[in-house]
């Protein structure tokens, strides 16, 4: 008897994180016995959507041509070959921006520090939200959320860090959201350029958590060394 | 070839009850999110409630707390129990059948012929 037939592969293009509005293709890529594929989002109906594979039959398009909340979510795929259906694929989570006004980001006391000091990047709501998430460009990983305690609102997040080096510098951005649905968040803040000086090169710290096994110096979590904003807001690494 | 027939609906008072049938044949009922859509004069259809194969519910704002939707696989149908229903509920109830995001779309891929709900004193 044969084993179970292997997952497929699950990918959205451009990416992940959609603007509402744009468009984004979600495919599934199964193997050459396909005879149908089908698409379903966690707590939703299933299924939710089924898709003759394309020729060589090894994958399916499953397209969104207009980003909204109600596509934002997790989703699993599945293959259908004539001995049965396969496991699900790893899961794809597909964020939506744009559901709220954007949060303002700034620097206290300024966004240009000297190598070795401290540095708080805020970002702020006009509303109260309960999760903040603060993204650093050209970061393999660059999320760092904030989230409330017990679903408290907050018009803010704080993200210490500190001892500032190199590594720090760049251009950051925050975004705000509800906990009833981390996949819809905020327009996206102006961005900041934390510009770090000072001739003294600071040893870079060694991150608590790696989040790659092969990082390199763009791919490192950001690593506040400060104690957790007296916010009410709880770190969680993405 | 009728794929879905849809029963059990007439003339009832308002705060009363009805239950709505669908039966389908084994095919789509068995790789289907089944619901239910209505139409009133004049007015544009909307998705009333719908159930998938995972027996997960999306019901419509505007009938939640009064409406329910389930099926049952041995007999391949998907029932609406509607209660405490009013005027406004009056319309033309159709049994649909088809992947969800078609339901979001308003293009499921199968449909019945509709049944008649009143609601009227």
């Known amino acids: 008897q044969a084993g179970p037939l292997p997952k497929p592969t699950l990918w959205a293009e451009p990416g992940s994180v959609i603007s509402w509005g744009n468009s984004v293709t979600i495919w599934c890529q199964g193997t050459l016995e396909a005879r149908e594929y089908r698409l379903d989002k966690e707590e939703s109906p299933a299924p939710w959507d089924r898709q003759n594979p394309l020729e060589p039959k090894n994958k399916a398009r499953f397209s969104i041509p207009s980003m909204t909340e109600d596509y934002a979510g997790r989703y699993r795929c599945y293959y259908r070959s004539p001995v049965g259906w396969s496991q699900p694929s790893d899961p794809l989570e597909l964020v939506m921006t744009g559901a709220y006004s954007k949060p303002t980001l700034s620097a206290l006391p300024s966004p240009l520090v000297t190598s070795g000091k401290s540095v708080t990047l805020l970002c702020q709501s006009r509303s109260p939200m309960d999760t903040f998430l603060l993204i650093k460009e050209r970061a393999a990983h660059p999320l760092l959320h904030l989230r409330s305690e017990h679903g408290a609102q907050q018009h803010q997040a704080e993200f210490p860090m500190s001892p500032v080096t190199s590594v720090h510098g760049g251009t950051y951005r925050c975004f705000s959201s509800h906990g009833f649905s981390h996949y819809l968040l905020s327009h996206p803040s102006d961005p900041l350029e934390l510009i770090v000086s000072g001739s003294l090169e600071d040893p870079r710290p060694s991150p608590t958590r790696s989040v790659s096994t092969a990082a390199g110096p763009e791919d490192q979590p950001l690593m506040p060394t400060g104690s957790v904003p007296h916010s009410g807001l709880r770190r969680h690494w993405e | 070839e009728v794929q879905l027939v849809e029963s059990g609906g007439g003339l009832v008072q308002p705060g009363g009850s009805l239950r709505l049938s669908c039966a389908a044949s084994?095919?789509?009922?068995?790789?289907?999110?089944m619901g239910w859509y209505r139409q009133a004069p004049g007015k544009q259809r909307e998705l009333v409630a719908a159930?998938?194969?995972?027996?997960?519910?999306k019901i419509g704002d505007s009938v939640k707390g009064r409406f329910t939707i389930s099926r049952d696989n041995a007999k391949n149908s998907v029932y609406l129990q509607m209660n405490s229903l009013r005027a406004e509920d009056t319309a033309v109830y159709y049994c649909?059948?088809?992947?969800?995001?078609?339901?979001?779309?308003?293009?499921?891929?199968?449909w019945g012929q509709g049944t008649q709900v009143t609601v009227s004193s």
């Open positions: 649909a059948a088809g992947a969800y995001v078609r339901f979001l779309q308003q293009s499921p891929d199968y």
């Open positions: 084994e095919s789509i009922f068995s790789s289907n999110v």
């Open positions: 159930v998938g194969i995972n027996r997960l519910t």
